[in-house]
Interface confidence: low
């Protein structure tokens, strides 16, 4: 019985040089044959001759010719066992076999590794007939071989369902070395030791390392690939490659940047997003981090009034987004802002310094001394007050807004007055007799609408009484300053 | 993706008022302000003002300050503009984009054309 | 408010030449933008921080300048390039600004 040997996937064999059964070659074509020119027996076993011991798979035929003699095993003739070459030459090595006649629809494939090469490949199977047997060469060429091309190659040949298998030729493809792991850019403390780290492989091997800094070699005993290189510290930034050598020659890695941590240049486009009456929202561009990621960024903000004391206001945030509010500022006022960012070194110079306002807002604080009385004989209320301090007007003020209540017998009635910003007096009509009168005051800006001040309480009699004194804001502790008549 | 969808086109009558919508996709609404840019037939661009998603704050150019009111809605991500006492004047393409942490117009929406016609 | 003066106002040019649109600032900005915009078509951010390409913008673009002049350079002009081309500012704000924009048209 025929038995089928799949050939598994094999690392080819590494000799130090050529052995017989083996060819090294540089060159193209090897072991090339003659296209269809005709039968060369001195590249062939013939069938009738003794052929060497053979591990390939043989098919014994059961078939037997007119004359009834016994016909030979099938098997692949012997052939180099083991090519060397260097990467980008070219190669041609094949197979071949004598089939006798009788046989039919023979083909033949070829395999790498344990896996059938289809299409892309140039494969030519040629035929010598003779009277009673042919002889069939099939070659396989690579135009241009890569380290991907390493490995063992067979022939298989289909007959009567039978399988026969060649021994494999193995293909070593040797080059300049490959690197497997390159030196890594990095970012390093100033005086502080790192490691890099750098392997190539052949074949051929040994792969020997050299380091190179700044263009100068650093070792010039070399290394065993691979290879890792202790540098003690750097001042300034340099440049780090290696070379790697073989008996082809030498290949150059990447040339790497060691970069020097450093404090980060300052932002940049420092810009107002908007503005509103006690807060700024500012956004800025980071400058270069100096090779060390942004931790964090101060705001400094002073006030731009040539008055003002110069004291700056610290505001810390996170390096990210580039954006902060800052808050509790003053209305109408002018401030400079600058900002600054730190990373693991240190903190950057601080931003060109932009001008920002704040806008007008509604008065923090209420009119002061709010006093109310009763004139009876016109039957007005008089209202007196002070403005609110420049300070926490917030704005330029445009005017007061009163607040005055009638509450009598169950019922209840608010009326507002708007009063022009000149004033610090009012006069509204009584609205009910025996009644009470709560009167309230606020300042208004363009901003808007500020704070009420604390209510202040006058009692109106019915018609007909005389006595009258004034109301007015209660000193602090009164919580509700009413003035009966 | 981000994107801003904006209806094609409103046809109002001379006097009336319009509130252009515009609405969001694609990231997180309240992390960026929206502007709106006007632009007339055949003319440049002309910024409106812009409104900050996350408390509704509004800045707006002078120009348009009595003529222009920005809102929005944020449980569906729509930012709105109206338009108010319209005339013949303010028939234009308006467009909102998103304005990205830089200040950069990074989106834009493909524009309303607005017609101002009795 | 920053007015942005564009010129010039139209301009034509051949495929291969180099191009040049400028931005005068009435008060000094810290930096400009530009957007290209084609008829029909939405604005598209081109150019950040005076000089940096937005995603997508050939490299032919190039943007410089500061104080109060910027200017937008295509280094060799090709057929998708004509459009009108706006400078834009927000370093002075309220109001941002843009200039009247540059048609840029094939020769």
């Known amino acids: 019985a025929i038995t089928e040997a799949r050939e598994e996937a094999k690392p080819y064999p590494l000799f130090p040089g050529p052995f017989p059964g083996s060819l090294q070659t540089d060159h193209t074509p090897l072991l090339s044959l003659p296209h269809a020119s005709g039968y060369q027996p001195a590249l062939m076993f013939s069938p009738t001759q003794p052929g060497r011991p053979h591990t390939g798979n043989v098919a014994i035929p059961q078939v037997t010719s007119v004359e009834s003699k016994p016909l030979p095993p099938l098997a692949f003739k012997h052939t180099v066992g083991h090519i060397i070459l260097s990467e980008h030459k070219g190669v041609k090595f094949n197979c071949s076999i004598s089939v006798p006649n009788i046989y039919q629809d023979t083909t033949i494939s070829w395999w790498k590794d344990g896996k059938e090469l289809l299409g892309a490949h140039h494969a030519i199977t040629q035929f010598y007939p003779d009277d009673e047997v042919t002889a069939i060469i099939a070659s396989f060429s690579i135009t241009s071989v890569q380290r991907s091309d390493n490995g063992s190659y067979i022939c298989k040949m289909k007959i009567n369902n039978e399988e026969i298998v060649s021994d494999p030729i193995y293909i070593e493809v040797q080059g300049l070395p490959h690197f497997t792991k390159q030196p890594e850019s990095m970012n390093v403390t100033r005086n502080t030791a790192f490691n890099l780290t750098c392997q190539a492989v052949g074949p051929p091997e040994p792969v020997n390392i050299f380091w190179v800094q700044n263009s100068s070699r650093v070792n010039e005993q070399p290394e065993k690939s691979p290879s890792v290189l202790t540098v003690p510290g750097l001042t300034e930034m340099a440049v780090f490659s290696c070379e790697a050598h073989n008996d082809k020659g030498l290949t150059v890695s990447k040339g790497v940047q060691i970069n020097i941590k450093a404090i980060p240049s300052p932002p940049t486009e420092v810009s107002i997003r908007n503005s509103t009456a006690h807060s700024i929202l500012i956004s800025w561009v980071p400058g270069f981090d100096g090779y060390s990621p942004f931790r964090n960024c101060s705001i400094q903000v002073k006030e731009a009034d040539p008055l003002s004391n110069g004291s700056v206001m610290i505001f810390n945030t996170s390096a990210l987004p580039h954006l902060y509010q800052i808050k509790q500022l003053q209305a109408l006022a002018n401030y400079s802002i600058g900002v600054s960012c730190m990373n693991e070194i240190g903190w950057s110079a601080v931003s060109p310094w932009i001008l920002a306002s704040t806008t007008e807002g509604a008065p923090s604080v209420a009119p002061l001394n709010v006093t109310v009385f009763l004139n009876e004989s016109s039957d007005n209320v008089d209202i007196r007050w002070m403005k609110p301090p420049t300070k926490q007007q917030d704005g330029e003020l445009v005017g007061y807004r009163i607040s005055h209540v009638w509450q009598s017998a169950g019922i209840s009635k608010e009326l507002l007055e708007e009063v022009g910003q000149n004033g610090s007096r009012a006069r509204i009509s009584v609205q009910v007799h025996n009644a009470t009168c709560t009167v309230r005051i606020a300042a208004v800006t363009r901003g808007g609408v500020g704070p009420f001040s604390d209510p202040v309480k006058i009692f109106i009699p019915a018609h007909g009484w005389v006595d009258y004194a004034p109301s007015s804001t209660p000193a602090p502790g009164n919580a509700d300053p009413v003035l009966i008549i | 993706q981000v994107q801003l969808q904006q209806p094609g086109a409103e046809l109002v009558v001379p006097g009336a008022s319009v509130r252009l919508s515009c609405k969001a996709s694609?990231?997180?609404?309240?992390?960026?302000?929206m502007h709106w840019v006007k632009q007339r037939p055949g003319q440049g661009l002309e910024w409106i003002g812009e409104?900050?998603?996350?408390?509704?704050?509004?800045n707006y150019n002078q120009k348009f300050k009595d003529k222009s009111t920005l809102s929005l809605d944020k449980s569906s991500s729509t930012a709105y503009m109206q338009l108010s006492s319209l005339t013949s004047e303010d028939s234009a393409v308006y467009y909102c984009?998103?304005?990205?942490?830089?200040?950069?117009?990074?989106?834009w929406g493909q524009g309303t054309t607005l017609t101002v016609s009795s | 408010q920053v007015v942005l003066t564009q010129s010039p106002a139209i301009m034509s040019a051949s495929p291969g030449e180099k191009v040049t649109i400028t931005c005068s600032a009435s008060?000094?900005?810290?930096?400009m933008l530009w957007f290209q915009q084609k008829p029909g078509t939405s604005p598209k951010l081109w150019i950040y921080?005076?000089?940096n390409l937005a995603s997508g913008v050939p490299a032919r673009f190039s943007g410089s300048g500061s104080g109060t002049s910027y200017s937008l350079t295509i280094s060799r002009l090709e057929a998708e390039d004509a459009a009108t081309y706006y400078c834009?500012?927000?370093?002075?704000?309220?109001?941002?600004?843009f200039g009247a924009g540059t048609k840029l048209e094939l020769k």
């Open positions: 984009a998103r304005c990205d942490y830089y200040g950069r117009l990074d989106y």
């Open positions: 694609g990231y997180t609404f309240i992390n960026y302000w």
């Open positions: 409104i900050d998603p996350s408390d509704s704050y509004a």
């Open positions: 008060s000094s900005v810290s930096y």
């Open positions: 921080s005076t000089s």
């Open positions: 834009q500012q927000r370093s002075s704000y309220p109001p941002i600004t």
